[in-house]
Each structure stands twice: as structure tokens, then as C-alpha cells.
Amino acid sequence: TPEVWVQVQMEATELSSFTVHCGFLGPGSISLVTVSWGGPDGAGGTKLAVLHPELGTRQWAPARQARWETQSSISLALEDSGASSPFANTTFCCKFASFPEGSWESCGSLPPSSDPGLSAPPTPVPILRAD
């Protein structure tokens, strides 16, 4: 069964910087990845980035850089411009559209007790969508 994992990491050197890592475990070719925060895409979440494996990426503030890390995983660097750190309590969701499986989405967040540099464990919470 396909699975999506999400890790949220606070940068040790820059407490206002976070990185979201997402990956797809399963067969099929990935056609699109959507990263959102505040909830799943299309269910209250706000898009931060959309990545196509060949056409390129699109990203919106506070996203700083979206990139493919492997053929089945991506990373999204976030820059928190505010003095406080809203990212710490935020849910980040990654949706992988793959052929022929359909869409798979999981969400994750930084654990409340996280030390800088530590990442949340993989949190596969699959939201099955036969898009």
C-alpha cells in the first residue's frame, strides 16, 4: 500500500527556519506534489508549494525553496519572518498524486518539545483520495 511520510525540522543554526521533508513510498510515477499548511490541501489548508517532476516548482511565502530531493521525495524550506514562531504549532501536509494509484496525503508537525536540529518522526496519516 502506498504511503506518504512527513518530517518537520527546525534548523539548529536559525530558529526561524524550518524545513518540511516529504516522501512517497510505493509504486507508480509521481505526477505532482502539493505542500500545504494549516490542514490538508482543499480542506482548510493553504498551499505553500506545488512541485512537478519535470515542469518545475511553484512556491509562495513563507516558503523559501521547494526542491526534489530524490525521485520520490521533496523538501520545502520555510522562513519565519515574525518574531514568534508560528511554524512550531503548525500542521504541514504533503499530497502526492501518482499514476495509477491516485492521491495520497499525510500531515505532520514539529513535536512541541523538539530541540533545534531534531526532526519529527515520520508521521504517515494517509488520507486516501481517488482523484
Epitope: T46, K47, V50, H52, P53, E54, L55, G56, R58, Q59, W60, A61, R67, W68, E69, T70, Q71, S73
Partner: antibody, heavy 114, light 113 residues
Framework: QVQLQQSGAELVKPGASVKISCKAT????????IEWVKQRPGHGLAWIGE????????NYNEKFKGKATFTADTSSNTAYMQLSSLTSEDSAVYYC???????WGQGTLVTVSA | DIVMTQSPSSLSVSAGEKVTMSCKSS????????????LAWYQQKPGQPPKLLIY???TRESGVPDRFTGSGSGTDFTLTISSVQAEDLAVYYC????????TFAAGTKLELK
């Protein structure tokens, strides 16, 4: 199928503003950016920026900041670009595009002339 | 910004000829993570918007004839038309799809000899 329908040609005076529209059909409007591209004869294609309908998140090319303003109306699946303080340098064909430039509108000719 | 440069600026060809045009970028368009090159090619005919031909440096868009081939990696890319047809006469643009802002080259104009 995906279609982007742009508003008609505009003749405007220097110093004035113009707002051009781009109506999208055939896909989920809020899912992908609407890009705006400028084309002047002899100057090639220049990316002005993009708006993500729904969240209204935007990215502007630094060269066009203060010149272009993007808005979008999800109820009518229409994106808008307003160009302000127009000069002869702004006379061009303006295109809207979506899905990483895979789909394009037919273009809107803006002519700035006294 | 990534600067895109195309050569030649124009080409005069006869129908049936093989044509090659070059595109160079000021920075690599290769993403090392997934080994994809983020470069696209467009065809524009007079009075029409550009049309996507090739993306990912070598993937043909749906409906594009197989006489169009994209190749290259890193900073050097090529668009080849194996046997030019009359309907191929147009301006061809390459585009950086790797990073913001998306940038286009000045284009190569394909003319009939």
C-alpha cells in the same frame, strides 16, 4: 479542455492604469498559478509574476514590482492584472498562462499613446 | 536571475532539412536530487501565444510531432527538428524552469530559405 480567455485590446494614455482579465475554464482554478508574461517586439518574453487563486498568494518579478498588481476572483474563475503609471515602455502584448506555461491565453495588446 | 542565451538568432532552412538550435543557461538547470533538467522549449507563430513543445529538457508535450527532440543537461541544451516542415516556421524560445524568476532566451527565428 483548458482554456484561458483574455480581455480585448486596450488603448490608454500615458500615466493612466489598465486592468486586463483572464478567465480560466476546464480545470480547478484555485489549484495552479496564473502567470503573467509581457512580450514586446524585439524584447522577447518577460515573466511579470504569478498569483495563486484562492489564497491570493503572489510572486512578482522584481522588475515589475510597483508596475503590476495581481488579483483573482474564484467565483468567476478570473484573474486580473492591473498595470499602473503607464508609459510607452508598457506597450506590449500581455499573456496569462497556467500550469507551468503549458496553457496560454490569446494575449491582450496594450497600447500606450497620447 | 538565470540568463538564457540562444543561438543562432535566426536560421534560414529548406523544407526537409535537419535543424539544430542551441540554448545556454548562466547556471545549471539540473536538479541533482531527481536528476531532472528544468528547461522548456516553446514555439511561437506570428499572432499566436507561445506553445509548449518540450519540458524537462527532453520530454515532448502531448501532441507534439516526434520530429522535435530536446537534449542536453546542465547549462547546454539543444532543440533538433529532424525534417523541417513549412508549419514549423516560427520563433523558438528556451526557458529556465529551474528557479525564480522564470526567464526566457531571446529566441531563434526559423525562416524559409
Amino acid at each position: 479542455q483548458v482554456q484561458l480567455q483574455q480581455s480585448g485590446a486596450e488603448l490608454v494614455k500615458p500615466g493612466a492604469s489598465v486592468k486586463i482579465s483572464c478567465k480560466a475554464t476546464g480545470y480547478t482554478f484555485s489549484s495552479f498559478s496564473i502567470e503573467w508574461v509581457k512580450q514586446r517586439p524585439g524584447h522577447g518574453l518577460a515573466w511579470i509574476g504569478e498569483i495563486l487563486p484562492g489564497s491570493n498568494s503572489t510572486n512578482y518579478n522584481e522588475k515589475f514590482k510597483g508596475k503590476a498588481t495581481f488579483t483573482a476572483d474564484t467565483s468567476s474563475n478570473t484573474a486580473y492584472m492591473q498595470l499602473s503609471s503607464l508609459t510607452s515602455e508598457d506597450s506590449a502584448v500581455y499573456y496569462c498562462s497556467s500550469y507551468w506555461f503549458a496553457y496560454w491565453g490569446q494575449g491582450t495588446l496594450v497600447t500606450v499613446s497620447a | 536571475d538565470i540568463v538564457m542565451t540562444q543561438s543562432p538568432s535566426s536560421l534560414s532552412v529548406s523544407a526537409g532539412e535537419k535543424v539544430t538550435m542551441s540554448c545556454k543557461s548562466s547556471q545549471s538547470l539540473l536538479n541533482s536530487g531527481n536528476q531532472k533538467n528544468y528547461l522548456a522549449w516553446y514555439q511561437q507563430k506570428p499572432g499566436q501565444p507561445p506553445k509548449l513543445l518540450i519540458y524537462g529538457a527532453s520530454t515532448r508535450e502531448s501532441g507534439v510531432p516526434d520530429r522535435f527532440t530536446g537534449s542536453g543537461s546542465g547549462t547546454d541544451f539543444t532543440l533538433t527538428i529532424s525534417s523541417v516542415q513549412a508549419e514549423d516556421l516560427a520563433v523558438y524560445y528556451c526557458q529556465n524552469a529551474h528557479s525564480y524568476p522564470p526567464t526566457f532566451a531571446a529566441g531563434t527565428k526559423l525562416e524559409l530559405k
